[in-house]
């Protein structure tokens, strides 16, 4: 029947497993008169045959490793042997079976690694080849460390990238390897095909000898640098050294200071470039970086600590031009009048900022000098000799010397003698009655005016009135502001009123003076007043416990994982239903009752992080009021993007014939997060069969060079498969194809005769 095994002459592709004895025909082509017979040409290798009636078959087992694709042509001939149809391309793709074992390129490898090398950074590659198809498990190699000798405390110091054969240190190896304790290690490495997943896989082993060398790339001890140095700058303060010559050193200022006073030279010596000022900045933390010639970091940055040592370069300063204190007429000896607090910008708790206070002058000296004393270290002024009389001297001026160990400063204090505080404040009303307010009354509203009077000397601390709410407002929803001229008190709302928690509040005010009352006088009921605040209910929307809820999860969490939760309460005590709004990617769902948020689809940091959605809390019943909060899901990166080519490389060509081996540079990238050091890709050819013609060499972490090994290339397109491994955790590998055309050139451009215009390369090498 026409269809799978028979039909007209047209381009076709067939896939046949290698190694199988022929068991059925490939295809029966049907002739259309005047065609009577068929002819087969191309890469038949005397295996593929077409009978005159169009029966295409093969006569012995195929071998993919000899030829992976047979490009055949079938033509229909008339009775004169003239082609009347075709020839059409017939492609036989030979499917791979696992009939080749992997083989290490060397039976023994040797390498060296520095102690404290970055974990995961390859220092040696073992390489095995398998002639089977790398695009199938048959040719997918899986490297493993069979044994590490010596093995200390059962801890593996080395790890191997099971796809690329890159050997690197584990975290423990990075921390614990020490050439003084153990200068050499031996690894036995195995390689299996079938991606290591099948019991039918073939394998090979090799031995790796590793020498551990000392790492001199270490952070120096913290440096202390005296401020305001008068020595000529720059001054060398410390140094770093990379393990090998030729590194390029630089400093990184993580704090982005407007003035960064450090530099590093190409020997790794670190300098301070200008005098430092401890009072501007008392410590610096920055990083020294060593890079290769291509600007890629060779290792992790080293943290450099510089502490700026204080010198006494700041005099004491007074708190204000004149500091004013009050003292009552009848105050007792020793009473505190007030404390003068001077400042010193030098380092706290050192001799440079330790202050002494001394009264150097009192005016007037009536009735005598030395009426006041000051505590030498605390700066507290006290009455020293006798009580004062306002009618004799209403005001005293003191000059106080404040000194540190090198500097002296004069500060001025004015002491006003005021009446004795023998009158208490008296409220004009003891009960301000009831006040009814809705619970949504605005914050800042004045809801009540209260008034007390005090018969003491006006505009002194004895007559000034401070109002306090002493009862009925434990939440601090209310406050009282005092007008200093009239002593009027304005009761204001400081926090939202709440019917649900305090429908009725019995508020008690107390009026008092900032100055103490004289001995024997006490505040009594006259200094107290009350009022009743009645709050009426307003149906309010639920309230979230936070404006923004934030959670952090790894982007590869399993579907159904709880990633966060939100909470809201309804002021009226109604139940709440939670929902999500703006989940544009369909990643999340929320439990309507509990507010727990779960993933419902694979998350992807590369699509955007944080992922922001709104959560809505709605009353169940009632007015169905709702409120909205934000939920921000921060996605932590996992290595889930294989490397790929950074751009489109179609159109690469070499002029044919090659006069000398040529090369071209290509760049790789991937979409995962690369923090300080950027990507660190490794490159290798995608299949063993390419190694006779091509080689790939790494330039840096993102770029590699593809070079021809000889000049004997046919005039056609070659597709070069390249493996790019990102060395991540887990390591991911991409196989990319670079199409390279060898073509006749006219004036440096690829020449194609008319009628062959498809895919003309545009970039010459």
């Amino acid at each position: 029947q026409e269809g799978k095994f028979s039909g007209p002459l047209k381009p076709m592709t067939f896939s046949i497993y290698e190694g199988q004895e022929p068991s059925q025909i490939i295809f029966q082509f049907k002739a259309n008169p005047p065609a009577v017979t068929f002819e087969l040409t191309g890469e038949t290798d005397n295996i593929f045959v077409i009978e005159r009636e169009g029966l295409l078959y093969y006569n012995r087992a195929l071998d993919r490793e000899t030829r992976s694709t047979h490009n055949l042509q079938v033509a229909a001939l008339d009775a004169n042997g003239i082609i009347v149809e075709g020839p059409v391309p017939i492609t036989i793709k030979v499917k791979d079976i696992n009939d080749n074992r992997p083989t290490f390129l060397q039976s023994k490898y040797e390498g060296s690694v520095r102690q404290n090398s970055r974990p995961g950074k390859p220092f040696l590659y073992v390489n095995a080849t398998d002639l089977d198809d790398p695009a199938t498990p048959n040719g997918q190699l899986y490297y493993q460390i069979v044994i590490q000798l010596p093995m200390i405390n059962n801890v593996m110091y080395f790890q191997i990238n099971n796809k690329t054969g890159a050997i690197s240190l584990t975290r423990e190896g990075s921390q614990e390897l020490n050439p003084a304790k153990n200068p050499s290690y031996n690894l036995v490495i195995s390689v299996k095909d079938m991606g290591g997943q099948s019991e039918n896989s073939f394998s090979d082993t090799t031995s790796v000898d590793i020498i551990v060398t000392e790492n001199i790339w270490k952070a120096p001890k913290p440096v202390e640098m005296v401020e305001n140095s008068t020595d000529p700058h720059p001054i060398k303060i410390t140094q770093v050294r990379w393990n090998d010559p030729g590194a390029q050193y630089s400093l990184v200022d993580k704090e982005k200071l407007p003035r960064f006073p450090f530099s590093i030279d190409q020997e790794g010596d670190i300098y301070v470039t200008q005098p430092l000022d401890r009072e501007e900045k008392d410590a610096y933390v920055f990083y020294a970086v060593a890079k290769d010639e291509y600007g890629k970091p060779l290792s992790y940055p080293l943290e450099i600590h510089v502490k700026v040592k204080d010198i006494n370069d700041n005099p004491p300063t007074c708190p204000s031009p004149v500091t004013v204190f009050e003292v009552q007429e009848n105050e007792r000896l020793g009473n505190s009048i007030g404390t003068l607090t001077a400042h010193d910008r030098d380092e706290e708790n050192t001799a440079n900022s330790f202050l002494n206070y001394r009264i150097v002058e009192q005016t007037p000296k009536l009735p005598m000098d030395g009426l006041f004393l000051i505590q030498t270290y605390a700066g507290m002024l006290q009455l020293a000799k006798q009580s004062l009389k306002k009618q004799d001297t209403p005001q005293y001026n003191l000059t106080i010397e404040v000194s540190d160990k090198d500097f002296k400063t004069l500060c001025f204090v004015q002491i006003n003698v005021i009446d004795i505080n023998d009158q208490i404040p008296i409220f004009e009303k003891s009960d301000y009655g009831n006040l009814t307010l809705a619970e949504d009354t605005n914050i800042g509203s004045t809801i009540l005016t209260i008034q007390a009077t005090d018969a003491d000397e006006p505009f002194t601390g004895s007559s000034k009135i401070l109002y306090h709410i002493i009862k009925g407002d434990s939440e601090g929803r209310l406050g009282v502001d005092t007008d200093p001229h009239t002593n009027t008190g304005y009761v204001i709302i400081k926090k939202p009123l709440d019917f649900e928690t305090a429908a009725v509040s019995n508020i008690v005010f107390k009026a008092e003076n900032p100055e103490p009352l004289v001995f024997g006088v006490k505040y009594n009921a006259s200094s107290f007043a009350k009022f009743t605040l009645i709050v009426t209910d307003v149906n309010e929307a639920p309230q979230f416990s936070q404006h923004v809820f934030q959670a952090k999860v790894s982007e590869d969490v399993a579907i159904g994982t709880k990633v966060g939760n939100v909470t809201a309460k309804d002021p009226e005590g109604l139940d709440i239903s939670y929902s999500l709004r703006g989940d544009t990617r369909g990643w999340l769902k929320i439990d309507h009752v509990t507010g727990e948020i779960f993933s419902v689809a694979p998350l992807d940091r590369e699509a955007g992080s944080p992922y922001r959605v709104q959560v809505v809390a709605t009353e169940v019943g009632g007015s169905s009021l709702s409120s909205v909060s934000e939920f921000h899901l921060i996605l932590m990166d996992v290595n889930d993007n294989p490397p790929r080519l950074a751009k489109d490389y179609t159109g690469l060509f070499f002029c044919h014939p090659l006069s000398a081996p040529g090369s071209l540079i290509f760049e790789a990238t991937d979409d995962d997060q690369h923090l300080f050091r950027g990507p660190h890709f490794t490159f290798s050819l995608g299949s063993g069969s390419l190694q006779n013609d091509w080689e790939v060499s790494k330039i840096n972490g993102t770029h590699a060079r593809l070079s021809t090994r000889h000049t004997e290339f046919e005039e056609r397109e070659y597709v070069v498969l390249i493996r790019i491994n990102d060395g991540g955790r887990p390591p991911l590998e991409g196989i990319v194809s670079l199409p390279v055309t060898f073509c006749s050139c006219v004036e440096g451009s690829c020449f194609r005769p008319a009628g062959h215009q498809t895919g003309i390369p545009t970039v010459g090498m």
Partner: antibody, heavy 123, light 107 residues
Framework: QVQLVQSGAEVKKPGSSVKVSCKVS????????IHWMKQRPGQGLEWIGY????????QYNEKFKGKVTLTADKSTSTAYMELSSLRSEDTAVYLC????????????????WGQGTTVTVSS | DIQMTQSQSSLSASVGDRVGITCKAS??????VAWYQQKPGKAPKLLIY???NRYTGVPSRFSGSGSGTDFTLTISSLQPKDFATYFC?????????FGQGTKLEIK
């Protein structure tokens, strides 16, 4: 040995028909195509068409379509060419020839020819 | 149709001469060209096929060359029996066509 023997000369009136035969021997008749050529005195050869006796496939030069019909009789290993509606310009020697190609060969040529048949159209 | 042009309708030469008979195709025919010799009252005889292959039994003094559109039949040393008419023929595409013939005469 291979031989192609054509029928004898014919004199025909305009508007009539003539059937010329070409009897082959010395090979399997169905393996090769038989071609017919026209040659007028002092002129070159013109290819009329061919017949493939095995599958009775024919192909004609567009110029002779409607004028010529090619047939074959496998039982007698004879190929025929019939000319219809004869006119004076049909006067010529008509030759049959074997095309040397057979499946799998590279023999692209007329290797054996008949002796020719003269057809004269005259009133 | 493809025209096969033999520009010399006749050619005079002597015994022992080397002669070349040319044939030009109106479009590319690759190497799908044969040469035939015909004597008066006789059927043509095959000399050369695929532009340059000598047919079995044909003397070696006959050779063919060319491809694409220009073809030549060369007789390296003329013999008395070589005086005849020579035709080229293309079988690259239907309808097949012959040249008008070149008559080789004794000088």
């Amino acid at each position: 040995q291979v031989q192609l023997v054509q029928s004898g000369a014919e004199v025909k009136k305009p508007g009539s028909s003539v059937k010329v035969s070409c009897k082959v021997s010395g090979y399997t008749f169905t393996d090769h195509t038989i071609h017919w050529m026209k040659q007028r005195p002092g002129q070159g050869l013109e290819w009329i068409g061919y017949i493939y006796p095995r599958d009775v496939i024919t192909q004609y030069n567009e110029k002779f379509k409607g004028k010529v019909t090619l047939t074959a009789d496998k039982s007698t290993s004879t190929a025929y060419m019939e000319l219809s509606s004869l006119r004076s310009e049909d006067t010529a020697v008509y030759l049959c020839a074997r095309w040397g190609y057979f499946y799998g060969s590279r023999s692209y040529y007329f290797d054996y020819w008949g002796q020719g048949t003269t057809v004269t159209v005259s009133s | 149709d493809i025209q096969m042009t033999q520009s010399q309708s006749s050619l005079s030469a002597s015994v022992g001469d080397r002669v070349g008979i040319t044939c030009k195709a109106s479009q590319n025919v690759g190497t799908a060209v044969a040469w035939y010799q015909q004597k008066p009252g006789k059927a043509p005889k095959l000399l050369i096929y695929s532009a340059s292959n000598r047919y079995t039994g044909v003397p070696s003094r006959f050779s063919g060359s060319g491809s694409g559109t220009d073809f030549t039949l060369t007789i390296s040393s003329l013999q008395p029996k070589d005086f005849a008419t020579y035709f080229c023929q293309q079988y690259s595409s239907y309808p097949w066509t012959f040249g008008q013939g070149t008559k080789l005469e004794i000088k």
